[in-house]
């Protein structure tokens, strides 16, 4: 063609995929009528008639644009619909007179990628692998023209580096056109990769400038082998019996090895290897003072057969032993006196404490109590606490009890009861004395008897009101080698209409629960005389 | 084109050692890992052990104390070793080819039965 | 390990239905997730690669989508060639898959 050499470059258009793509024939009214314009396609250099401009008037070419051309700005612009990226080609306007002259439109064609879809080595990368490994893949999938990847490690982008980092990209070409990129990234990894964040950038360009895609950034899983192994004792700090402790086995390796923990045996002195649950956590539930000793751990490679071996760790798991306390049954008689001594062994240092067990009353700090001039009320229990002040919950208590020689000694003297007739009672009387009395009623009916402790008795009994019954009222009396006492238990008749609710409870030490013949069940309620109780 | 094919005995007794050969064509060991799956008959599929296109092993640790995996570049071929076979194990085991991390290619699989 | 749960076990349709198969991870494996066809002395073929792009040579009656933890295979439009079992695996942290759909023609 005449004159080729001195064309200019061609006009430069940039546009999305999917838009319209504007073709301004640039043309001046010198170069050509507008009004008679043949608009071509040049692909391959091969140029293709594609829209006819006559007297103003647009006409397509059959053929691939047919559906997609049209006239605006009064004809001097080809409007062309729903760009692919086929369409990035030159275009051409030719006038026709006074002499024909072209005018070339370079039209770019763009389509941002999808965002990058990184993966990792499902598997990892060990170490030592002999080359570098697939670390990760990035996909970019649907841009226009092919993105550019970048590679960054902990921020900072990843060059190649013979036998350490290589970056293998490839695209393919989908049926509309667009490019699928796949970059992978190969390395060999070291140890220190284990927490470092790996991600993909994809550079593109638009219209509107450059632009880039980050994946979500992602860990690799990283082997290497154990260099170091230790134990870690759960809960630290000081162990005492009844505690649950777990002996743990770690290794700085990963995959971590096989552990095998084992505990030195003082008379062999020969490790014995502990059973460990499937984590290979040895758990002491609950400790004894025999779990303490030397505990060590092996770690193995199975690949490999090459055993670690942990530094020895000392367990000492702190204890009281059983509390004995001298005499273990003491007996005096009113006026006496009388020493206990409480003794105990512990890994640690000990504080002995008594204790009244009735009150919890703190008597004596140390092992020895001392009791002077005993009166009746000293008789009953007494507790020895060995405690190690530095493990809190670390204490084992001995319960002693002092019996007083002495006649029965009653819990009330006299009691009232409401009670309706025929009515079945429930009367209880309580004594105490030692030796241990026994109790008899002054009635028939129904007795039973317990022990409340060695000294003290309960005798229940069920018995029938009757007027008789009524009139007498009830006595019971304890007995024992010493002698006896007696207390006296009044019937009264009570209107079962005027019991309220609140009458139902029991007060005082002895319960009469009354209940009609034909023994359905009614309570009674006894309540104790206003005036104090004679005791003994 | 790409092919893999698994080839190794059809029968094995208990307690045996089954080994299990995976010969690939039109790609290179080298650029391409290569993993063993099974199929127990009537059950799923199952992933026993790989080696990547660096010579790492990887191995399910459900079979790890039993498994060997190993290549031969100049041969194409991936080697499977299995030791102390039961019954249970009894499946068709296939070869499969990493691209690079999922299977794109597989071989058609040989069946083995444990029995005595 | 990451567990993946397949539904239906098993489905039976006419030639030309629309039939899908989900797929459910025990935990997010992102797109890391393939689906695979196998039919009885056959090479097990790959459909479906990171989750939702076709493997060539596959008909585009199979699409996959999903990401995270759920995922479907879909056949627009079933045809008697298609019967088989399909599985899915996830690739995101080791491989495991999932208990498989047998596809049968009614």
């Known amino acids: 063609v005449p004159g080729e050499a001195e064309q200019p470059a061609p006009e430069l258009v940039e546009v999305e995929v999917g838009s319209t793509a504007l073709l301004k024939c640039g043309l001046s009214q010198s170069q050509g009528n507008l009004s008679h314009v043949d608009w071509f396609s040049v692909h391959k250099e091969k140029r293709t008639l594609i829209f006819r401009v006559r007297q103003g008037q647009g006409q397509s070419e059959p053929g691939e644009y047919e559906q997609r051309l049209s006239l605006q700005d009064r004809g001097a612009t080809l409007a062309l619909t729903q760009v692919t990226p086929q369409d990035e080609r030159i275009f051409l306007c030719q006038g026709k007179r006074p002499r024909s002259q072209e005018y070339r439109i370079q039209l770019r064609v763009y389509k941002a990628p999808e965002e990058p879809n990184i993966q990792v080595n499902p598997l990892g990368i060990p170490v030592n692998s002999k080359e570098p490994e697939e670390v990760a893949t990035c996909v970019g999938r649907n841009g226009y023209p092919i993105p550019q990847v970048i590679w960054y490690k902990n921020g900072r982008p990843l060059k190649e580096e013979k036998n350490r980092v290589h970056i293998q990209s490839s695209q393919t070409v989908e049926s509309s056109g667009l490019y699928t990129l796949q970059s992978i990234l190969k390395a060999q990894l070291v140890k220190e990769d284990k927490d470092a964040q790996f991600y993909c950038e994809l550079n593109y360009r638009l219209p509107s400038g450059n632009h880039m895609k980050e994946s979500r950034e992602v860990t690799v899983p990283v082997f290497y082998p154990t260099e170091k192994v230790w134990l870690e004792v759960e809960p630290v700090g000081m162990l005492k019996e009844g505690d649950r402790v777990e002996i743990r086995c770690l290794a700085d390796g990963n995959p971590p090895p096989h552990f095998s923990i084992s505990k030195g045996n003082p008379s062999t002195r020969e490790a014995e290897e502990e059973t460990t649950n499937d984590n290979g956590v040895l758990v002491l539930e609950p400790a004894r003072k025999e779990h303490s000793g030397r505990y060590e751990c092996q770690a193995w490679n199975l690949d490999t057969m090459i055993s670690l071996l942990s530094e020895p760790q000392e367990l000492l798991v702190n204890y009281v032993s059983d509390v004995r306390v001298s005499p273990a049954a003491p007996e005096r008689q009113e006026g006496s006196s009388l020493t206990l001594t409480c003794e105990a062994e512990s890994s640690q240092d000990l504080e002995f404490q008594w204790l009244r067990e009735e009150t919890d009353q703190v008597l004596e700090r140390g092992p020895v109590l001392q009791l002077h001039d005993l009166k009746r009320e000293a008789g009953g229990g007494y507790r020895c606490v060995a405690s190690v002040p530095s493990i809190p919950g670390l204490n084992r208590t001995q319960l002693v009890k002092l019996a007083i020689f002495g006649p029965p000694w009653m819990a009330f003297k006299e009691r009232k009861v409401w009670v309706k007739e025929n009515m079945v009672l429930n009367l209880s009387c309580e004594a105490s004395g030692h030796p241990r009395p026994t109790i008899s009623w002054n009635v028939n009916g129904t007795a039973s008897e317990g022990d409340q402790d060695p000294q003290r008795v309960l005798s229940t009994l069920n018995v029938l009101v009757t007027p008789e019954l009524l009139e007498t009222g009830v006595e019971c009396t304890a007995s024992n080698d010493l002698g006896k006492n007696t207390s006296i238990l009044f019937l009264e008749l009570v209107n079962l209409t005027t019991l309220t609710p609140d009458s139902n409870t029991t007060t005082g030490l002895s319960t009469s629960t009354a209940s009609p013949h034909t023994r359905a069940n009614s309570t009674s309620t006894e309540r104790k005389l206003p005036e104090p109780e004679s005791r003994g | 084109q790409v092919t893999l094919k698994e080839s190794g005995p059809v029968l094995v007794k208990p307690t045996e050692t089954l080994t299990l050969t995976c010969t690939v064509s039109g790609f290179s060991l080298t650029s391409n890992g290569v993993s063993w799956v099974r199929q127990p008959p009537g059950k799923a599929l199952e992933w026993i052990a790989a080696?990547?296109?660096?010579?790492?092993?990887y191995y399910n640790s459900a079979f790890k104390s039993r498994l060997t995996i190993s290549r031969d570049t100049s041969k194409s071929q991936v080697v499977l070793t299995m030791t102390n076979m039961d019954p249970v194990d009894t499946a068709t085991y296939y070869c499969a080819r990493h691209r690079p991390f999922y299977f794109d290619y597989w071989g058609q699989g040989t069946l083995v039965t444990v029995s005595s | 390990d990451i567990q993946m749960t397949q539904s239906p076990s098993s489905l039976s349709a006419s030639v030309g239905d629309r039939v899908t198969i989900t797929c459910k991870g025990s935990?997010?494996?992102?797109?890391?997730l393939a689906w695979f066809q196998l039919k009885p002395g056959k090479v097990p073929k790959l459909l479906i690669y990171d989750a939702n792009s076709l493997q060539t040579g596959i008909p585009s009656r199979f699409s996959g989508s999903g990401s995270g933890t759920d995922f479907t295979l879909t056949i627009s439009s079933l045809q008697p060639e298609d019967v088989a079992t399909y599985y899915c695996q996830q690739y995101y942290s080791g491989y495991t898959f999932g208990g498989g759909t047998k596809v049968e023609i009614k």
């Open positions: 080696i990547s296109s660096g010579g790492s092993t």
């Open positions: 935990q997010n494996i992102y797109k890391s």
